[in-house]
Interface confidence: medium
């Protein structure tokens, strides 16, 4: 009724001293590798020569911090960020930051980034969109209330409002260019 070698689980590491034989009823606790977090029970139990329980390690890391218009990241750049790691932004002059200066990797998702707004209410260049472009020549600065229009590349369909407007130093939500479904 004893159990032999410990079962292995992806990204899980057994804690304590490894043994050749485990007695019935004996429990072994696992911990997760860096960037991973235990989802559910962390131990296995030896019952009737078999191990019961399945520790599951979930990847809680983040990649690619959110892009913030008119800002740059001032903290250390990493290829992978563990949960709890923070990334700090700074606005380019003359933009002013509104919102939390930092984003945090929270169990695999980034928290909401700040915005960098021009205190005069002006906007920078319109945000680029995938598979689409603005119909006018892009300027470096746009006056408050000015607007631009987007158009999609061939075979792509526009979703949302094609016109965006500069309000309080921020552009309104740009449209998306979607590939039409092929049946």
């Amino acid at each position: 009724t004893d159990c032999l070698s410990l079962p292995s689980f992806e990204n899980a590491i057994p804690m304590g001293e490894k043994k050749d034989v485990y007695k019935a009823g004996e429990q072994v606790t696992y911990t997760c590798a860096t960037y991973y977090k235990m989802d559910g029970a962390s131990n296995v139990t030896c019952i009737n020569s078999r191990w019961t329980g399945r520790p599951t390690c979930r990847d809680t890391s983040c990649v690619n911090p959110p892009t913030v218009q008119n800002a740059y990241i001032v903290s250390r750049q990493m290829s992978k960020y563990p949960s709890g790691e923070r990334v700090r932004y700074q606005c380019r002059s003359p933009y002013e930051m509104f919102g939390d200066e930092e984003v945090m990797c929270l169990n695999g998702n980034w928290t909401e980034p700040p915005q960098c707004k021009d205190s005069t209410g002006k906007c920078g260049p319109p945000p680029p969109i995938d598979n689409g472009d603005i119909t006018s020549f892009p300027l470096s600065v746009y006056a408050p209330a000015s607007s631009v229009e987007y158009q999609c590349q061939n075979l792509y369909q526009l979703e949302g409002n094609k016109r965006i407007t500069c309000r309080n130093g921020q552009w309104s939500e740009p449209p998306k260019c979607l590939h039409p479904c092929v049946i």
Epitope: M97, G99, D100, E101, T111, E112, P114, Q115
Partner: antibody, heavy 117, light 107 residues
Framework: QVQLQESGPGLVKPSQTLSLTCTVS????????VYWIRQHPGKGLEWIGV???????EYNPSMKSRVTISKDTSKNQVSLKLSSVTAADTAVYYC???????????WGQGTSVTVSS | DIQLTQSPSSLSASVGDRVTITCKAS?????LHWYQQKPGKAPKPLIY???NLASGVPSRFSGSGSGTDFTLTISSLQPEDFATYYC??????????FGAGTKLELK
């Protein structure tokens, strides 16, 4: 460990300016934003405003004209000033640290303010 | 501005019960946070960003939802869970708002 403590007068006369201080320890105001929240007797929570780590402020639109939040990083203090107070400003005032995503992780114990002549 | 409507406003339950509190936003939101408050005390964070348990919070608490509908669930009510619960939202384009609260009382 992280702590926030509100202080200020418990009684303020109508039309005067309410001044409260939040003294923090266990973290730096250059790294975290601090919120002010209030709670009227027997009622829910109301956001007053926030001062971000970089010093920019945001206020509840309903109180914006009367509120000023500032900080002295060297003293680890955040201050709240609320002008032209009335009996409707009678509440428990809390300061709280920003966690991320506009959530609060650590709160002060609150300070009770009564507006009365 | 986005309004948060909590239901029920009060709830009577017994130790061991499974309890669900809902928070409905007037328009779609990305994140919602939950707090617990006991009489005479400051609120305490329970759940961040819809489903992430705050530090030191027992696993009997869980959060879920998306869009406009969110829930806080207590799988097996304990004596220390009787309190008032608040949901909260804030985005870069909306003021920070709290729900009106749900008072959880002993049946």
């Amino acid at each position: 460990q992280v702590q926030l403590q509100e202080s200020g007068p418990g009684l303020v006369k109508p039309s005067q300016t309410l001044s409260l201080t939040c003294t923090v320890s266990g973290f730096s105001l250059t790294n975290y934003g601090v919120y002010w929240i209030r709670q009227h007797p027997g009622k829910g929570l109301e956001w007053i405003g926030v001062i971000w780590s970089g010093g920019t402020t945001e206020y509840n639109p309903s109180m914006k004209s009367r509120v000023t939040i500032s900080k002295d990083t060297s003293k680890n203090q955040v201050s709240l000033k609320l002008s032209s107070v009335t009996a409707a400003d009678t509440a428990v005032y809390y300061c709280a640290r920003n966690f991320g995503n506009y959530a609060m992780d650590f709160w002060g114990q609150g300070t009770s303010v009564t507006v009365s002549s | 501005d986005i309004q948060l409507t909590q239901s029920p406003s009060s709830l009577s339950a017994s130790v061991g019960d499974r309890v669900t509190i809902t928070c409905k936003a007037s328009s779609s939101v990305t994140y919602l946070h939950w707090y617990q408050q006991k009489p005479g005390k400051a609120p305490k964070p329970l759940i961040y960003a819809t489903s992430n348990l705050a530090s030191g919070v027992p696993s009997r608490f869980s959060g879920s939802g998306s869009g406009t509908d969110f829930t806080l669930t207590i799988s097996s009510l304990q004596p220390e869970d009787f309190a008032t619960y608040y949901c909260q939202h804030r985005s870069s384009s909306n003021p920070l708002t709290f729900g009106a609260g749900t008072k959880l009382e002993l049946k």
